[in-house]
Amino acid sequence: SAPGEDEECGRVRDFVAKLANNTHQHVFDDLRGSVSLSWVGDSTGVILVLTTFHVPLVIMTFGQSKLYRSEDYGKNFKDITDLINNTFIRTEFGMAIGPENSGKVVLTAEVSGGSRGGRIFRSSDFAKNFVQTDLPFHPLTQMMYSPQNSDYLLALSTENGLWVSKNFGGKWEEIHKAVCLAKWGSDNTIFFTTYANGSCKADLGALELWRTSDLGKSFKTIGVKIYSFGLGGRFLFASVMADKDTTRRIHVSTDQGDTWSMAQLPSVGQEQFYSILAANDDMVFMHVDEPGDTGFGTIFTSDDRGIVYSKSLDRHLYTTTGGETDFTNVTSLRGVYITSVLSEDNSIQTMITFDQGGRWTHLRKPENSECDATAKNKNECSLHIHASYSISQKLNVPMAPLSEPNAVGIVIAHGSVGDAISVMVPDVYISDDGGYSWTKMLEGPHYYTILDSGGIIVAIEHSSRPINVIKFSTDEGQCWQTYTFTRDPIYFTGLASEPGARSMNISIWGFTESFLTSQWVSYTIDFKDILERNCEEKDYTIWLAHSTDPEDYEDGCILGYKEQFLRLRKSSVCQNGRDYVVTKQPSICLCSLEDFLCDFGYYRPENDSKCVEQPELKGHDLEFCLYGREEHLTTNGYRKIPGDKCQGGVNPVREVKDLKKKCTSNFLSPEKQNSKSN
């Protein structure tokens, strides 16, 4: 029988009445154009909704936007358009919400062509009040908040000026001209690229990378011949043009650009690209595109300095620059990532790693599923997950995979079971152990979301017809109840719940369509009365993460330590609550070869834990660049995985000697850098 229809599924008692009393409808009295929704702050209940409309094919002769505010998680909304003087707000800039709980909001207005500059509306009290400010420039990008100080804003102008405000947008100062890209770093530092000759496009590969640590009083040129740059974790990356040809290489800095090292990654040509897939303070996942229009490349994982890289996964699917990749960080379990590879036969297959890219494997076939037509052997196949690429290909996949850090072990995704991703209509699968095992959760495509740290999962069927039914589960997707939230079906456009999955409120967004008009409508359902009591100690059970062999003393060891979690029992129907904190007990493991990546010049043959020398480097001295000096590496092929906490056990030797020679290939050596003050 289909999931959730088994006889033993326990029913939640009287849920219809409980939910009916907690279902709140709001019809937005405006024409249906686009709608955007933003949460202001954490646990504040404040939501801002901006609806915008303008007549298609007519250049802004008629447009309106309306601003609505809720302070009860979307149950009620108040039209606050008058607070922004009924001004048309530019949706392409969205609503710039300040970091943390600053309560700051910036809206960018549409202004008439002849005006001297743009206009913004600013709030620092969670959108209770707004101040109109006319800008001395026309913004090209959304206002960007400094992560450290929400009073500091930066923006680029349509004339490529870099503008900074130190008083939350009240006053603005142009600190540099001819700027292509600007980003906040740590400690209120701004990194930006500049062009000298024509434009950002014309000077691509000849840009300069600058840094200011005092909001534009003084500057330092920290790189030349720059193609692009990026920040990830504690790493600053620059893609730099080679001196002699059109290739470029990645350089890395861990000291805000004062010193650079060339990453031991392949160089790329004009048509290729690098992409930082994921980064934290320990390491980086880097994708390097293959030459030619292959649609794939190679994933490399870095050491703790971001310099030495190991090949992690071949034929990694990534279509074009700024294109689609299925690379997904499974946030509900440490070390787990899912992505897709393009096979030799051009089929797409899903791979998963449980040890931060050390080893990749196929996803285990769900026990309650049959292999589909793509499978050569009907008894042996895997689960393949639909993510960004499938969505971009307009397959019937309404949502990417979902996981939440505080819903430990839970991963929900659309997928198909076979030898490769299928173009047939997918089903929804769930894992409760971080991706080791999977179960079919719902038949056909659905929208889904996690509430109350995993205590409730909500789903809505993906349909072209109007809907009025929501499904929910209180046991991690094993059993489902259905609730009719409105008599009159609506055209569904999306589910919205507060980021962080701690809320018990879900908003169903859609529109009503009549012969006369079309209006936005939201239904907010509060599940608090379904989970009547607070969870107690007896509702939780101990769970060892990454456990595959309970007999083994090292069972659960990943990246040098194991973790035991307290997890809610599936049978417990209770509230984790907004203040729920994941309880975990770590313990250190002995080191084994699994705790080491293959060093520069070494690789791991498939199904082998030993690292062997790359044939093309056999007998060569292993030399690489570090801080603009040449280093000699003495290694037996292993290096500790960044973030690995193991102690004792296996301990391979690794030594780095300074050859006291300058690297001719390092384009970002310190003597090429200079400073200046305003």
Partner: antibody, heavy 119, light 108 residues
Framework: EVQLVESGGGLVQPGRSLRLSCAAS????????MHWVRQAPGKGLEWVSG????????GYADSVKGRFTISRDNAKNSLYLQMNSLRAEDTALYYC????????????WGQGTMVTVSS | EIVLTQSPGTLSLSPGERATLSCRAS???????LAWYQQKPGQAPRLLIY???SRATGIPDRFSGSGSGTDFTLTISRLEPEDFAVYYC?????????FGGGTKVEIK
């Protein structure tokens, strides 16, 4: 060119029926609600009926409710008005009209088809 | 239903003069849903103004609309010979859609 062409009008006796058609071209017919508006000789405009893009929502003026039926065939880019139990006061020029946008006024009108109800 | 009352019923003016046409609603209408049409003898109506104040494509800028709530106005700043016609206001806010009775602008 965006165009609406009505047909099916004529002289009919009271109590009898008539079916009007409106052929649409030059725009994506299935994306828009459509309407019928009439104008009695020498009088003002009167909205008769409207139908949503997918036929899921339909409305009528009180004066025609229960007697007239609006329908559409998106595959044929056609709008219809089935008029039963016709009365002398239904005598008018019948226009089909397309809204400028969802919930908007009518930017495209046909040339009209004349319906005369007389014994 | 929302009743729209137009005044005056007839407006006699000379070319070059300013014409001011009024449309009053029996209950408040959101300006997004109010429109004005022009109709000449033997022709279908032509959309002039939508959203109470936005000119439709191809409409000269001598036509302007204003108003909110229950009172709306169509203004023709300088009458041209081709502007003499009947003008209707319309609301599309609620069903049934209704038109005003019309104002005839004739040559004095």
């Amino acid at each position: 060119e965006v165009q609406l062409v009505e047909s099916g009008g004529g002289l009919v006796q009271p109590g009898r029926s008539l079916r009007l058609s409106c052929a649409a071209s030059g725009f994506t017919f299935g994306d828009y609600a459509m309407h019928w508006v009439r104008q009695a000789p020498g009088k003002g405009l009167e909205w008769v009926s409207g139908i949503s893009w997918n036929s899921g929502s339909i409305g009528y003026a009180d004066s025609v409710k229960g007697r007239f039926t609006i329908s559409r065939d998106n595959a044929k880019n056609s709008l219809y008005l089935q008029m039963n139990s016709l009365r002398a006061e239904d005598t008018a020029l019948y226009y089909c009209a397309k809204p400028l946008y969802r919930g908007g006024p009518f930017d495209i009108w046909g040339q009209g088809t004349m319906v005369t109800v007389s014994s | 239903e929302i009743v729209l009352t137009q005044s005056p019923g007839t407006l006699s003016l000379s070319p070059g003069e300013r014409a001011t046409l009024s449309c009053r609603a029996s209950q408040s209408v959101s300006s997004s849903y109010l429109a004005w049409y022009q109709q000449k003898p033997g022709q279908a109506p032509r959309l002039l103004i939508y959203g109470a104040s936005s000119r439709a494509t191809g409409i000269p800028d001598r036509f302007s609309g204003s108003g909110s709530g229950t009172d709306f106005t169509l203004t023709i700043s300088r009458l041209e010979p081709e502007d003499f016609a009947v003008y209707y206001c319309q609301q599309v806010a609620v069903s049934p859609i209704t038109f005003g009775g019309g104002t005839k602008v004739e040559i004095k």
